[in-house]
Structure formats: structure tokens, C-alpha cells
């Protein structure tokens, strides 16, 4: 006999990286018929939802109106059908950004390179941090972690057209508190014409909504959203 229900999905909308003082919604998707959802923060109960009518609802939303460092951390959710509880969801790392300062991102030998050339990004921040994060914008959400007293280097090695795209970096004061994002650096990799034309480029965020990759479809893409965030979140652990 089944002792627990399948674990729910958890994700943040519009994104798990939240600028300070901005709002975010933590979503938990379980099963139709769930009479209670619980959201846990760092292992302690944070909020409870008892959806009505439960048989018509399989997703609940926990609204956080004003993101700050006290709200940043690891969240998980569970749900109950009758007296039977689910397994806990995966952990959601909610990160507060736009803390303190803005790093500078540069690229060597430059933003326009030839396929096969070695490229290194440099992220510099003069305040007290020793961990840096380099993110390539787009759905694949590539994240690299680097270390250094005031600067970290991110060698990409010999690049291909798949490395094309817009990059930003953050200084990290702890796992869940990041600096303002750097200004974007767009890397242009040219190869032979055939390769260049065929290489798909990640969709990038609009310049004014960086970091808020919106998934407006309620079904189908939610798991993609969780998987997409998962790449970046693994670096936080």
C-alpha cells in the first residue's frame, strides 16, 4: 500500500532570482483533490494553503510581496490528500539580487571572436565577496561559479557558435544574496557560414526584463521551467 503521494513541483514566478523589494510568487503543483499544501522555508513551516474546491485545483501560489535577504533561502512544499501526505518537492533556492554593488564584466580577447578561439570572461567587484557567478541569458540558463578576492575568471576554452549570446555576472555575498547584475556583454562567435547559420541561439531576455523569463502557459512548460531553473540551482548547492 502506498505510504506517500508523489512529490509536487515547486518553482518561482517570474524567476528564482528576485531583485530586492520586488515581488515573487512561489508555486506548488501537486494533485487535484489535495486538501492542504504546506510551504517550508529552511525546514520550518512558512505558509499553508487549503484550496477550495480541492477537486478543481492542483496548483497553489504563495505570494511574497517584498523580497529581501530574510526571505531568500531554500523552500520546499508538500501536499495532502485525505490523511496521506506527499513526498517533499525538490528544493527551490530563492535568491535575492540587486544587493549592494554592481560588478564589471569583461571578456578577453574581446566580444567578437572566431570559432575555436579561447575566450575568458572576467567578473570584478571591489566589495567583500569572493564568489562570482557568470550567467548566459536564455532558456538553458548556463551558470558558472568562480572565486577570487576581487575578480574571478571564467575560461570558456575554445568557443563554438553555441557560445554566442549575452552574458552577465553577479557577485555573491552568500548562496542566496547576489549583487546587482553586471552590464551585459554580448559574445559574437563567427565560424564558417554554414555552421553559423545553423547554430541556434538561446532566446534572450528583453533588455529591460532580464532575469524574468516568463512562462505564461500554465501547463506543459511548468516542468520545463523547473528543469531550466534546476541547472542554475544546482550551482547553489
Amino acid at each position: 500500500q502506498q505510504q506517500t503521494l508523489p512529490k509536487p513541483f515547486i518553482w518561482a514566478e517570474p524567476h528564482f532570482m528576485v531583485p530586492k523589494e520586488k515581488q515573487v510568487t512561489i508555486c506548488c503543483q501537486g494533485n487535484y483533490g489535495a486538501v492542504e499544501y504546506q510551504l517550508h522555508f529552511e525546514g520550518s513551516l512558512f505558509a499553508v494553503d487549503r484550496p477550495k474546491p480541492p477537486e478543481r485545483i492542483n496548483k497553489v501560489q504563495f505570494y511574497i510581496p517584498d523580497m529581501n535577504s530574510r526571505m531568500a533561502g531554500q523552500y520546499s512544499c508538500i501536499y495532502r490528500v485525505g490523511e496521506l501526505w506527499s513526498e517533499p518537492s525538490n528544493l527551490l533556492d530563492l535568491v535575492v539580487t540587486e544587493m549592494y554593488d554592481t560588478p564589471t564584466l569583461s571578456v578577453h580577447p574581446g566580444p567578437e571572436v572566431i570559432s575555436g578561439e579561447k575566450v575568458t570572461f572576467y567578473c570584478r567587484l571591489d566589495t567583500a565577496t569572493s564568489m562570482f557567478l557568470l550567467l548566459k541569458e536564455g532558456r538553458s540558463s548556463h551558470v558558472q561559479r568562480g572565486y577570487g578576492k576581487v575578480q574571478a575568471e571564467f575560461p570558456l576554452g575554445p568557443v563554438t557558435t553555441a557560445h554566442r549570446g549575452t552574458y552577465r555576472c553577479f557577485g555573491s555575498y552568500n548562496n542566496h544574496a547576489w549583487s546587482f547584475p553586471s552590464e551585459p556583454v554580448k559574445l559574437l562567435v563567427t565560424g564558417d557560414i554554414e555552421n553559423t547559420s545553423l547554430a541556434p541561439e538561446d532566446p534572450t531576455f528583453p533588455a529591460d526584463t532580464w532575469g524574468t523569463y516568463l512562462l505564461t502557459t500554465e501547463t506543459g512548460l511548468q516542468k520545463d521551467h523547473a528543469l531550466w531553473d534546476h541547472t542554475a540551482q544546482n550551482l547553489l548547492r
Epitope: 512558512f46 499553508v48 494553503d49 487549503r50 497553489v60 505570494y63 510581496p65 517584498d66
Partner: nanobody
Framework: EVQLVESGGGLVQPGGSLRLSCAVS????????MGWFRQAPGKGREFVAA????????YYADSVKGRFTISRDNSKNTAYLQMNSLRAEDTAVYYC???????????????????????WGQGTLVTVSS
């Protein structure tokens, strides 16, 4: 400016009852989840009870379940905590709290963590003693 003002505290004998009130001004009370917390002498702040803005969901700490009842009257911008069968260990300063932000809260959500609340009252003392 947001103001939360508790009232109704006092001295009561074990087994007795009290009703605490929390009047809220300066916010759109009717769409805000609310909570009650308490702090006993020499101890940390402890969750007591919470209520969704629609009153459809209430949630209680195990230590008060079956004895305390949280309610609200949105037309009066007031939340209540009815406390029955009071015990000596219920002695504490009781605080009401309101979540922050705008009107985007689900009608069925309650918050149990103190960090989720933005605005707090000054507290009212409840003493249970014979």
C-alpha cells in the same frame, strides 16, 4: 502609516477565557492574511494562529489547537483571537501581525512564519494565574 493596535489582554485564572482584538488602519485590511504570535518571558516569538483574508483558512499551533479560535471582521478592519481554557503556559505578550505588500494574496493562504509579516502591533499582555 500602518497601525495595528491590540486590546483585550489582562489577568485571568486558569481555565478562563479572553478575547483579543487587533484593529488595523492604514492598509487594505480586507485582502491581507493576518496572524497572532506570542512571546513568553525569556523566550522567543512563537506562532499562535493565522487566518486567510477571506477567513476560509485558519491554522493553529498545536499548543493552542481546540482552545483558541482566530477570526476576523473585514467590515471593521479587525482580527480576533478567542482564547478559552487558558493555562499558565499561555502567559505571554500577544502580538497581531499583517503581511506586507499589495492585494495579490490567495484567498485560502495563511502564513505561519514571523518573517512573512511586515507590520506588527505593540502587543498586549495576557497573564494566566490563580
Amino acid at each position: 502609516e500602518v497601525q495595528l493596535v491590540e486590546s483585550g489582554g489582562g489577568l485571568v485564572q486558569p481555565g478562563g477565557s479572553l478575547r483579543l482584538s487587533c484593529a488595523v488602519s492604514g492598509r487594505t485590511f480586507s485582502r491581507l492574511p493576518m496572524g497572532w504570535f506570542r512571546q513568553a518571558p525569556g523566550k522567543g516569538r512563537e506562532f499562535v494562529a493565522a487566518i486567510s483574508w477571506s477567513s476560509s483558512t485558519t491554522y493553529y499551533a498545536d499548543s493552542v489547537k481546540g482552545r483558541f479560535t482566530i477570526s476576523r471582521d473585514n467590515s471593521k478592519n479587525t482580527a480576533y483571537l478567542q482564547m478559552n481554557s487558558l493555562r499558565a503556559e499561555d502567559t505571554a505578550v500577544y502580538y497581531c501581525a499583517a503581511v506586507g505588500g499589495s492585494l495579490d494574496y490567495s484567498a485560502t493562504v495563511v502564513y505561519t512564519a514571523a518573517r512573512a509579516y511586515a507590520d506588527w502591533g505593540q502587543g498586549t499582555l495576557v497573564t494566566v494565574s490563580s
